[in-house]
Each structure stands twice: as structure tokens, then as C-alpha cells.
């Protein structure tokens, strides 16, 4: 079952998943000036069996130069700047998807992909929060949110994270504090570790990832 809402928004923080539960869908979105090919898939789907999960369908973008791309015909109500519905992930693939059964790893980028990724999460999905650059994490508890089903409705748990405006940033669970940080790389926050099995597995996964996984656009 798809989660009804998006994960909660935390001021001055972004979220990402370390792995995606089977059933998760990813929109095939193209960058400006390109569009999905007519016969192409609308979504990629994380699918699999007990031993192997992978993304079904392929996203393909083609130039829309021959088409009129100015399609706004009436003003949007209370016009707003476009926001990243779900944080874009970097194309790094350091973790074997089989390390978390029933989950897919981040799909590789496709040509002319949009600079944001829009996911449709399923019940049981966990996402992790990190303060944006220039903000420091104050933890009251785990900086994570899980989509849960209660009384036939889905809800995301509230991450216990406050981002305060200091020139330091937090990291994903399991990331080690660097010996020296000439580029001002984020410090580790160990207080966000909890003891659920799922989280431990994903913490181990997170430990193998570099801070660049929070890049919102491909270089």
C-alpha cells in the first residue's frame, strides 16, 4: 500500500531513503526541454522475490524542442517556487541491493533525467533526515521517519530532529567523524542510533556512503 502523504518536512532539513521497499515507484521525470518518450514508462517499480529486488521499467527522455514547452495556461493559485518533492540522490551505488532483502537500492540515473526524483513510498519505508548545510542537528531521538499503517490509514512517524543555525551540519546515522575536515564536512551524530533491526542494517549501509549522497543535482 502506498503511503498517503510525503514524509514530514523538518525546517532546514532534507530526507532520503537508504534503500527502497518493494512496491516503491519512481516517476520517470525529464529535465526542462525534454519529455518522456511516448511509449515510455511512467514509473519505475521496485520489484522482486525473496532473494533479489530490482527496478522494473526504464525511464527514457527525448528532446521536446519541436513542441511548445510553455504550457502554463492559467496562473497557478498562489504561485509558488518549485520544491524538491523528494531529494535527488547522487548516482553513487556503493551498496549491494541484496544487503537489505526486499529492498532496491537507488536506481542509476537516466539520460536527461530531471534534477529531482519523485518517489511514491510504501508502508514500512524508512527515511533519514539531515540538516542542510549551515545548520546543526539537535536530536531528541532518532532522525528518521517510518510510514506506518494504523486503522486503515497511513502516517509517517515524526522524526525527532531540530536543525539549529550554526555553521556545522549533521550526517546520516553511522557516518564517522572525519579526522580532518578541510572542506568542512559534516560531523557525525551518534545520538540518532536506535536498536531496530531494519535501522541497524540501514545504518551499516549508510556507513559505506559518503556525504555526497545528499547532492541534490548531478554534477
Amino acid at each position: 500500500e502506498l503511503c498517503d502523504d510525503d514524509p514530514p518536512e523538518i525546517p532546514h532539513a532534507t530526507f532520503k531513503a537508504m534503500a527502497y521497499k518493494e512496491g516503491t515507484m519512481l516517476n520517470c521525470e525529464c529535465k526542462r526541454g525534454f519529455r518522456r518518450i511516448k511509449s515510455g514508462s511512467l514509473y519505475m517499480l521496485c520489484t522482486g522475490n525473496s532473494s533479489h529486488s530490482s527496478w522494473d521499467n526504464q525511464c527514457q527522455c527525448t528532446s521536446s524542442a519541436t513542441r511548445n514547452t510553455t504550457k502554463q495556461v492559467t496562473p497557478q493559485p498562489e504561485e509558488q517556487k518549485e520544491r524538491k518533492t523528494t531529494e535527488m540522490q547522487s548516482p553513487m551505488q556503493p551498496v549491494d541491493q541484496a544487503s537489505l532483502p526486499g529492498h532496491c537500492r537507488e536506481p542509476p540515473p537516466w539520460e536527461n533525467e530531471a534534477t529531482e526524483r519523485i518517489y511514491h513510498f510504501v508502508v514500512g519505508q524508512m527515511v533519514y533526515y539531515q540538516c542542510v548545510q549551515g545548520y546543526r542537528a539537535l536530536h531528541r531521538g532518532p532522525a528518521e521517519s517510518v510510514c506506518k499503517m494504523t486503522h486503515g490509514k497511513t502516517r509517517w512517524t515524526q522524526p525527532q530532529l531540530i536543525c539549529t543555525g550554526e555553521m556545522e551540519t549533521s550526517q546520516f546515522p553511522g557516518e564517522e567523524k572525519p579526522q580532518a575536515s578541510p572542506e568542512g564536512r559534516p560531523e557525525s551524530e551518534t545520538s540518532c542510533l536506535v536498536t531496530t533491526t531494519d535501522f541497524q542494517i540501514q545504518t551499516e549501509m549508510a556507513a559505506t556512503m559518503e556525504t555526497s549522497i545528499f547532492t541534490t543535482e548531478y554534477q
Epitope: E29, R35, Q76
Partner: nanobody, 126 residues
């Protein structure tokens, strides 16, 4: 010229029902995702429901799930929002929107939608 025209709004008592329609011209609904948003006075625009033309994904805001149903008649190029068990907090201007890509849902997800109607007022009295 693309046009989305909403109709079916009005004044209804708490617990009542309304069926909103969205008639499209200039685009074909059978290759567009269709969505409904709403905006109450002094509040941000809010996602209500969306459904792609392939019926792969249908999403609802948790506040309306189980009460509202989004449907579409691709042949007639019309979308619908059936609203049951209406509450005073459902009072808003309801907008129909469409896009060529897949469903985009969420709190402030309107930006990716390409086409918008002018809105229809729904008022639920207590």
C-alpha cells in the same frame, strides 16, 4: 488553447456530498495525469488527489482518504472528484490540474502540473 473548467461546487451542509467535474479541451486526458488541489482563504494550496491515465497510481491526501474519490472519463475528457461526508474544514476553492508525467502528490506539489483550471468554490456549513 488548453482549458480546464471546473464545475459542481456550491454550498452544502456538514455530512453532505458534492461531485466536482473538470472538463478539458485542447489536451487529451488519456495521456495526462489529473489532480485536484484546494486552497482555503489565507492558507497554502493543498494537494487533494491525483490519478494517472493508466490507473497505475492514485493518491489521496490523508485528510480526504476514504471520503473523496477521484475518477476520470478519458473518452469524455473529463475528470471527477466525488466528495462525501463533507466537513467545514473542506471549505475551499477546488482546482483541477493536469500534467503529462506521472502522479505528483504532497503538501506543495502543484509546481509540476502544467495546466490549471480557474477553480470552483466549495463551502461546507456547520
Amino acid at each position: 488553447q488548453v482549458q480546464l473548467v471546473e464545475s459542481g461546487g456550491g454550498l452544502v451542509e456538514t455530512g453532505g456530498s458534492l461531485r466536482l467535474s473538470c472538463a478539458a479541451s485542447g489536451i487529451t486526458f488519456n495521456d495526462h495525469t489529473m489532480a485536484w488541489f484546494r486552497q482555503a482563504p489565507g492558507k497554502e494550496r493543498e494537494f487533494v488527489a491525483a490519478r494517472d491515465w493508466s490507473d497505475i497510481i492514485t493518491r489521496y491526501a490523508s485528510s480526504v482518504k476514504g471520503r473523496f474519490t477521484i475518477s476520470r472519463d478519458n473518452a469524455g475528457n473529463t475528470g471527477f472528484l466525488q466528495m462525501n461526508s463533507l466537513r467545514p474544514e473542506d471549505t475551499a476553492v477546488y482546482y483541477c490540474a493536469a500534467r503529462e508525467g506521472g502522479v505528483v502528490a504532497g503538501v506543495r506539489s502543484g509546481a509540476p502540473y502544467d495546466y490549471w483550471g480557474q477553480g470552483t468554490q466549495v463551502t461546507v456549513s456547520s
